[in-house]
Interface confidence: low
């Protein structure tokens, strides 16, 4: 075209993808009649006629633009709707009269990329690798033109650095003409980078100016050798026998080394490996005083086969030994005195208490209990409790039975029992004394004795109610070396009118019981005995 070299730079029109571009033909009236104009698109230096204006009327040419062009502003402006990246080219209008002149417009198209998507390398990166390793990948989809990417570590931009930082970016063109940018950050990392925050930033331009979008921050797994291993004990604080104690190894490497826990044998002073669970934790449950001692942890790095040892840690499992009471089985006459002494060993200072077993009453705070002017009632159980006040729950106890010499003492002297003929009675009689008494009955039947405690005995008797038995009644006699004593059971026939609704049950046994510590009580139920077999 003659004189093309002198053509002024094309007018710049900037629009976003999807919007409408207004292409205003800048020919003056002297350069051409705007009622007679041809519009061309120029792509790779090839002109294509896309629109004609004749007598102010517009007509699209068949082709890629025919559905998207229209005339505005009394014919001076061509509107291109739904702009795509492929529309970024030169458009020109050419006036036909009085002589052929043209006006060029450069259309620039923009589209903000989507939020950048960052993916960290989940496989991790070893420190001191021979070459930069993949840290993360940043993807910015559907932008136009190609956005610029900047990588940041801990808020500071990263620059290419030979053998240290390498940024590898590539782009693909989608069918829409938009670009998807992929940028891979490769770096040589050090141990301190285990907590480093990486992110990428996309810089792009719109008609309104420059903009940027940031990805989320990510950390990358960093593999680094262990420099230190140490032991941790749970629970913290004072330990006692019976506790569940966990001893675990910890390390400052990633991944952690393979751990083993050893305890020093107090005899040989040799470290002996302990058996840990599948998580490498040594569980002492229940902890015993023998678990006390010096523990250490060994961490073996399987990559380097370097072994590291922790500082040894002393473990103290506090204990209270078995409690010993002297005398162990005291016997005293009524009116005499008795001194009970309690002993125990512990890893800590001990506190002693004496309690009455039957009532729980505290009698003495200290290892020695003195009892004076002993009565029969003073016989029975006394408990010594040895405890460590600084460690709640750490205590041991011992029960001692004090025996007061005396003749048998009956739970009741006499009582009435309601019965029916032919029923089987289950009678009981209880006595105490020291030495422990034995019980005999004045009637034949099946008797059995049970020792209730060192001074107390309970005898039960099963007997058939007969007219003779009703007449004689039943006596139980308790005797020991120091004397004897008797209880009498009076048997009374039940009238039918006094029967309770369930007193004719055929399964129960009549019982009559009493105890020195409870009020005597007696219940009766009957059991029919089988009739003798009749012989024909």
């Amino acid at each position: 075209v003659p004189g093309e070299a002198e053509q002024p730079a094309p007018e710049l029109v900037e629009v976003e993808v999807g919007s409408t571009a207004l292409l205003k033909c800048g020919l003056s009236q002297s350069q051409g009649n705007l009622s007679h104009v041809d519009w061309f698109s120029v792509h790779k230096e090839k002109r294509t006629l896309i629109f004609r204006v004749r007598q102010g009327q517009g007509q699209s040419e068949p082709g890629e633009y025919e559905q998207r062009l229209s005339l505005q502003d009394r014919g001076a402006t061509l509107a291109l709707t739904q702009v795509t990246p492929q529309d970024e080219r030169i458009f020109l209008c050419q006036g036909k009269r009085p002589r052929s002149q043209e006006y060029r417009i450069q259309l620039r198209v923009y589209k903000a990329p989507e939020e950048p998507n960052i993916q960290v390398n989940p496989l991790g990166i070893p420190v001191n690798s021979k070459e930069p390793e993949e840290v993360a990948t940043c993807v910015g989809r559907n932008g136009y033109p190609i956005p610029q990417v900047i990588w940041y570590k801990n808020g500071r931009p990263l620059k290419e650095e030979k053998n240290r930082v390498h940024i590898q970016s590539s782009q693909t063109v989608e069918s829409s003409g938009l670009y998807t940018l992929q940028s891979i950050l490769k770096a040589q990392l050090v141990k301190e980078d285990k907590d480093a925050q990486f992110y990428c930033e996309l810089n792009y331009r719109l008609p309104s100016g420059n903009h940027m979008k940031e990805s989320r921050e990510v950390t990358v797994p960093v593999f680094y050798p262990t420099e230190k291993v140490w032991l941790e004990v749970e629970p913290v604080g004072m330990l006692k026998e019976g506790d569940r104690v966990e001893i675990r190894c910890l390390a400052d490497g990633n991944p952690p080394p393979h751990f083993s826990i050893s305890k020093q044998n107090p005899s040989t002073r040799e470290a002996e490996e302990e058996t840990t669970n599948d998580n490498g934790v040594l569980v002492l449950e229940p902890a015993r005083k023998e678990h006390s001692g010096r523990y250490e942890c060994q961490g073996l790095d399987l990559d380097t086969m370097i072994s590291l040892l922790s500082e040894p840690q002393e473990l103290l499992v506090n204990y209270v030994s078995d409690v010993r009471v002297s005398p162990a089985a005291p016997e005293r006459q009524e009116g005499s005195s008795l001194t009970l002494t309690c002993e125990a060993e512990s890893s800590q200072d001990l506190e002693f208490q004496w309690l009455r077993e039957e009532t729980g009453q505290v009698l003495e705070r200290g290892p020695v209990l003195q009892l004076h002017d002993l009565k029969r009632e003073a016989g029975g159980g006394y408990r010594c409790v040895a405890s460590v006040p600084s460690i709640p729950g750490l205590n041991r106890t011992q029960l001692v039975n004090v025996a007061i010499f005396g003749p048998p003492w009956m739970a009741f002297k006499e009582r009435k029992v309601w019965v029916k003929e032919n029923m089987v009675l289950n009678l009981s009689c209880e006595a105490s004394g020291h030495p422990r008494p034995t019980i005999s009955w004045n009637v034949n039947g099946t008797a059995s004795e049970q020792d209730q405690d060192p001074q107390r005995v309970l005898s039960t008797l099963n007997v058939l109610v007969t007219p003779e038995l009703l007449e004689t009644g039943v006596e139980c006699t308790a005797s020991n070396d120091l004397g004897k004593n008797t209880s009498i059971l009076f048997l009374e026939l039940v009238n039918l009118t006094t029967l309770t609704p369930d007193s004719n049950t055929t399964t129960g046994l009549s019982t009559s019981t009493a105890s020195p510590h409870t009020r005597a009580n007696s219940t009766s139920t009957e059991r029919k005995l089988p009739e003798p077999e009749s012989r024909g």
Epitope: P256, N279, D303
Partner: antibody, heavy 121, light 111 residues
């Protein structure tokens, strides 16, 4: 000795949920990751994802994002695979495999015996 | 994703002879001097068993008749001499990047 023992076979209806367990013994559970691999009847092996037993962080292959969840019960040295909203194409044997990963190594060195999941209406 | 192409799909080898299985990756699985290629053996009804790690290292307890070689994109598993118990399906697998992928498998029969 090192063992991975998986839970027994499962028969489920479409839309139901299944949770497979993989109990590890004989090694320190938190020193190794755990991979999960799918094998459809008569087909090859397909990697589903892995879970970092030290941090509890799961990573999934694209085809197994959404309905699939990897989890741990570290105190019991057990890893779990849960599949929600079961579909017919989930019918397969699922393997857990210990992940020997460190600075220079990423191997699946010990495998569970596999758990067969049948999906049938 | 890295695609692993195994060949042949199946092969029959006489007892005592050599079996060679090939695995080609769609891009390099080597970095920092290491090749992240692994070989597994699977028998019917059993889980896979690791044979070779990092392309050429024999896993502990695996017989020395198994060997692996290769780097970059081309890898080979050799079994020599083949024994009756080697009848199985063999898979290659990479762990260069996520996702890990397996080859489609090679079924070895013993003649």
């Amino acid at each position: 000795q090192i063992q991975l023992v998986q839970s027994g076979p499962e028969l489920k209806k479409p839309g139901e949920t299944v949770k497979i367990s993989c109990k590890a013994s004989g090694y320190t559970f938190t020193n190794y990751g755990m991979n999960w691999v799918k094998q459809a009847p008569g087909k090859g092996l397909k990697w589903m994802g892995w879970i970092n037993t030290y941090t509890g962080e799961p990573t999934y292959a694209d085809d197994f994002k959404g309905r699939f969840a990897l989890s741990l019960e570290t105190s019991a040295s057990t890893a779990y695979l849960q599949i929600n909203n079961l579909k017919n194409e989930d019918m397969a044997t699922y393997f857990c495999a210990r992940y020997r990963y460190n600075k220079y190594e990423r191997a699946m060195d010990y495998w569970g015996q596999g758990t067969s999941v049948t999906v049938s209406s | 994703d890295i695609v692993l192409t195994q060949s042949p799909a199946s092969l029959a080898v006489s007892l005592g002879q050599r079996a060679t299985i090939s695995c080609r990756a769609s891009k390099s699985v080597s970095t920092s001097g290491y090749s992240y290629m692994y070989w597994y053996q699977q028998k019917p009804g059993q889980p896979p068993k690791l044979l070779i790690y990092l392309a050429s290292n024999l896993e502990s307890g695996v017989p020395a008749r198994f060997s692996g070689s290769g780097s970059g994109t081309d890898f080979t598993l050799n079994i020599h001499p083949v024994e009756e118990e080697d009848a199985a399906t063999y898979y290659c697998q990479h762990s260069r990047e996520l996702p890990f992928t397996f080859g489609s498998g090679t079924k070895l029969e013993i003649k």
